[in-house]
Amino acid sequence: AVNGTSRFTCFYNSRANISCVWSQDGALQDTSCQVHAWPDRRRWNQTCELLPVSQASWACNLILGTPDSQKLTAVDIVTLRVMCREGVRWRMMAIQDFKPFENLRLMAPISLQVVHVETHRCNISWKISQASHYFERHLEFEARTLSPGHTWEEAPLMTLKQKQEWICLETLTPDTQYEFQVRVKPLQGEFTTWSPWSQPLAFRTKPAALGKDT
């Protein structure tokens, strides 16, 4: 939702969290603002306090329940409002009718581990976190490997077009330190975006055996 120079963007993690960012040029830093969530068909509502993340933007997380509980479904619509205190009154600064499963951003994958490492290849697995059972297997992943002397931005992206929570990295250099990251995205949702990248997993390939090419 955009009003003039105001921007209000929220994502649902598919379980029990809606994260919101509100930015407004010229807003006062010390103003007290909140996000209010009112589902259209549920008995609960929720509020979070917007905290500054930069000069003109604020963020907060609406915690709807325990991390793995399915608090919203595919047919829910949530009215989200930014409310700011002006003296003794609250003023509405932004509003949107939010369809949670059209605006998804999952949690970053977790539990990255090296399953098997050789001189030229490495098998890595991970788990998805707090993802709805609704997606069945209809998720995709992107992965990247950081090579020595390069930046993450230079790393080519590898795409896994199905729910595959492992990868076999090939053509690696022996006895070399690498880092690996992965992110996840459901197919569902017009405004759905990639999860944050996972924490990097560091690993080292095995040295080449002397006198033979492995």
């Epitope: 399915q70 595919a74 499963f101 059972h133 609704y134 997606f135 069945e136 017009e190």
Partner: antibody, heavy 117, light 107 residues
Framework: EVQLVQSGAEVKKPGATVKISCKVS????????IHWVQQAPGKGLEWMGW????????EYAPGFQDRVTITADTSTDTAYMELSSLRSEDTAVYYC??????????WGQGTTVTVSS | EIVMTQSPATLSVSPGERATLSCRAS??????LHWYQQKPGQAPRLLII???QSISGIPARFSGSRSGTEFTLTISSLQSEDFAVYFC?????????FGQGTKLEIK
């Protein structure tokens, strides 16, 4: 292998109630959605509703809301669809199907219900 | 309720030829459109999700595309087992609704 096996054909009188079962195997029933769909003779498909076994919630299409009840027994991995106040236009094949909320990935073989006086 | 209109109602095509089936939504549904195939006496089978994503195990000759509110299912080279009824279904607005179907028959 994912399988949904439905109960057999039924013949009912107008005003009666029918209850169809859908026994599933090959996936975790407790973390699934089971949909029900009606297909009247020579007509298209009509989505009736679903049960979300994890969330313990049901969702019904407005056209069926007053007469349909979807339930599940997680101890036997079986879903049920009960349709009450039957009329002749309820004569149809009824399907259960597994999926996410948005589409139906695996279907049962269908149960024919005939409503006739 | 969103109305899904499929055209044509019946399509006659020779084996080996290309078949193009259309599905139009009465309002914008983003990419929330799914295709099913139904053969006589059988349950429907899911073919394509979100307008263009093929389901694993479905032959590569089946493909989907979208232009605004119009969605197209294309079968590039018809096999004998492809002659069936095809349904589209939207999942953008509750309740989910199906098109009335296109019957694909042998010419």
């Amino acid at each position: 292998e994912v399988q949904l096996v439905q109960s057999g054909a039924e013949v009912k009188k107008p005003g009666a109630t029918v209850k169809i079962s859908c026994k599933v195997s090959g996936f975790n029933f407790k973390y699934s959605l089971i949909h029900w769909v009606q297909q009247a003779p020579g007509k298209g498909l009509e989505w009736m509703g679903w049960i979300d076994n994890e969330a313990g919630e049901t969702e019904y299409a407005p056209g069926f809301q007053d007469r349909v009840t979807i339930t599940a027994d997680t101890s036997t991995d079986t879903a049920y669809m009960e349709l009450s106040s039957l009329r002749s236009e309820d004569t149809a094949v009824y399907y259960c199907a597994r999926g996410g909320p948005w589409f139906l990935s695996y279907w049962g073989q269908g149960t024919t219900v005939t409503v006739s006086s | 309720e969103i109305v899904m209109t499929q055209s044509p109602a019946t399509l006659s095509v020779s084996p080996g030829e290309r078949a193009t089936l259309s599905c139009r939504a009465s309002q914008i549904i983003s990419n929330n459109l799914h295709w099913y195939q139904q053969k006589p006496g059988q349950a429907p089978r899911l073919l394509i999700i979100y307008g263009l994503q093929s389901i694993s195990g479905i032959p590569a000759r089946f493909s989907g595309s979208r232009s605004g509110t119009e969605f197209t299912l294309t079968i590039s080279s018809l096999q004998s087992e492809d002659f069936a009824v095809y349904f589209c279904q939207q999942s953008n607005n509750f309740p989910w609704t199906f098109g009335q179907g296109t019957k694909l028959e042998i010419k």
